[in-house]
């Protein structure tokens, strides 16, 4: 008789999750010499230990502390790029602008990017059938708590000028409920961070509006200003040209506004 299993509303753990995390860890530590000291088996053990045998709606940041310790990494604090609802372009940008880092360019972000995972209370099994959905089931699930934890730490580490890439095609360009809006904004340290510079990425070819005047951007400016951090905003009208000019800044067409 099959054992009763909790049915959650979200997709189950990504198939081959343990193998994927371990393989990503090995690959990352091979590519990044400063992380060669990392013991990937210990990293996997700590990752697994954060959620295995625990109720998937009762995960805490404490559960992830061993993983955080083992994955501790120093990135240049003045080269941090945050993003909201525009991950692909942010990653394309840091692949070209190699001295800037998104969270997914760090070991822990790289390990978990695009993966889903959860366990079951009191069993050592990984649940490949379903995992809790943040809205429909619970917010304290393994994936949400992981991203909340690493995002908080990433924002806390930032200094000087912090950049954030925002999606100008969305109805809420700045969304208070996004990870950026609910976690990262509130964990930037005013004593270290001088300015938050938003890059609003336009979607339409002929979109010449100044999206920096959008009400949600004004809301972001208000939140940031109240935290004693300066705010600036730039429209990126042509993201394709923007990336091209990052690759070839000496190109003559790159002197005009992008």
């Amino acid at each position: 008789v099959p054992r009763w299993r909790q049915q959650w509303s979200g997709p189950g753990t990504t198939k081959r999750f343990p193998e994927t995390v371990l393989a990503r860890c090995v690959k990352y530590t091979e590519i990044h010499p400063e992380m060669r000291h990392v013991d990937c088996q210990s990293v996997w053990d700590a990752f697994k230990g954060a959620f295995i045998s625990k109720h998937p709606c009762n995960i805490t940041e404490e559960d992830y502390q061993p993983l955080m310790k083992l994955g501790t990494q120093t990135v240049p604090c003045n080269k941090i790029l945050l993003w909201s609802r525009i991950k692909d372009l942010a990653h394309q940008f840091t692949q070209v602008q190699r001295d800037m880092f998104t969270l997914e360019d760090t070991l822990l972000g790289y390990l978990a990017d695009d993966l889903t995972w959860c366990g079951e209370f009191n069993t050592s099994k990984i649940n490949y059938q379903s995992c809790p959905d943040w809205r429909k089931d619970c917010s304290n699930n393994p994936v949400s708590v992981f991203w909340k934890t690493v995002s908080r730490r990433f924002a806390e580490a930032a200094c000087d000028v912090v950049h954030v890439m925002l999606n100008g095609s969305r109805s809420k360009i700045f969304d208070k409920n996004s990870t950026f809006g609910s976690v990262e904004v509130h964990n930037l340290q005013p004593e270290k961070v001088q300015t938050l510079e938003a890059w609003v990425i336009h979607g339409g070819r002929e979109d010449s509006r100044d999206l920096c005047q959008d009400p949600t951007i004004k809301e972001l400016e208000s939140i940031i200003s109240k935290r004693n951090i300066q705010f600036s905003c730039k429209n990126i009208y042509r993201p394709d040209k923007f990336l091209q000019c990052v690759k070839n800044p000496e190109d003559s067409s790159c002197t005009s506004e992008i």
Partner: antibody, heavy 120, light 111 residues
Framework: EVQLLESGGGLVQPGGSLRLSCPAS????????MTWVRQAPGKGLEWVST????????WYADSVRGRFTISRDNSKNTLYLQMNSLRAEDTAVYYC???????????????WGQGTTVTV | QSALTQPPSASGTPGQRVTISCSGS????????VSWYQQLPGTAPKLLIY???QRPSGVPDRFSGSKSGTSASLAISGLQSEDEADYYC????????????FGGGTKLTVL
């Protein structure tokens, strides 16, 4: 019976060296992180250093970093603390403690040795 | 000076309930599990509470732990003379190179 038994303490001149040992018995030593904690006379507990189950990663208190080295030999079920450039302020009882298991269902120091005294 | 702040002393009469506080910050207690240790005179420390609230087997249920935000506390109910000891809280620190931090310790006297 789960047991930790420190040895290697003694009287040493400032600038000198000592190596503490802590053999473990009664549990799977290679499945636990291990930690050294010290206690100066009449003072509180002070964390010194921690090493992971595999020995692949270690952390040190600011007060000992660069002078002390934690290591382990899982084949001998033994934890070590090599102490160089010793100072008067390193005088203390040194305890070894079993720390986080590699299942990570808790992090705390749940088994302690009886301590060994280092006098500088 | 310890990263975690405990009152240096506490006292109570047999049968009473005593609480010992442990105050930290967002870089330690807030996001890490707290553990509590009892050290009887002349002996090694002993684990009383782990993961904020859990008791190891063999520890009487008179001992209980709690945590809220950047503070934690240890409660001892039905105080007994053998509870006279030093009590320490400990947690992990989020700093890059460190790991454990301890409170300065609280000397509990049973009157």
């Amino acid at each position: 019976e789960v047991q930790l038994l420190e040895s290697g303490g003694g009287l040493v001149q400032p600038g000198g060296s000592l190596r503490l040992s802590c053999p473990a018995s009664g549990f799977d030593f290679s499945s636990y992180w291990m930690t050294w904690v010290r206690q100066a006379p009449g003072k509180g507990l002070e964390w010194v250093s921690t090493i992971t189950d595999s020995g692949g990663r270690a952390w040190y208190a600011d007060s000992v970093r660069g002078r002390f080295t934690i290591s382990r030999d899982n084949s001998k079920n033994t934890l070590y603390l090599q102490m160089n450039s010793l100072r008067a302020e390193d005088t203390a009882v040194y305890y070894c403690a079993r720390d986080t298991p590699k299942t990570y269902y808790y992090y705390a120091m749940d088994v302690w040795g009886q301590g060994t005294t280092v006098t500088v | 000076q310890s990263a975690l702040t405990q009152p240096p002393s506490a006292s109570g009469t047999p049968g009473q309930r005593v609480t010992i506080s442990c105050s930290g910050s967002s870089s330690n207690i807030q996001y890490s599990y707290v553990s509590w240790y009892q050290q009887l005179p002349g002996t090694a420390p002993k684990l009383l509470i782990y993961n904020n609230v859990q008791r190891p087997s063999g520890v009487p249920d008179r001992f209980s732990g709690s945590k809220s935000g950047t503070s934690a506390s240890l409660a001892i109910s039905g105080l007994q003379s053998e509870d006279e000891a030093d009590y320490y809280c400990a947690t992990w620190d989020e700093s890059l190179l460190g790991l454990w931090v301890f409170g300065g310790g609280t000397k509990l006297t049973v009157l």
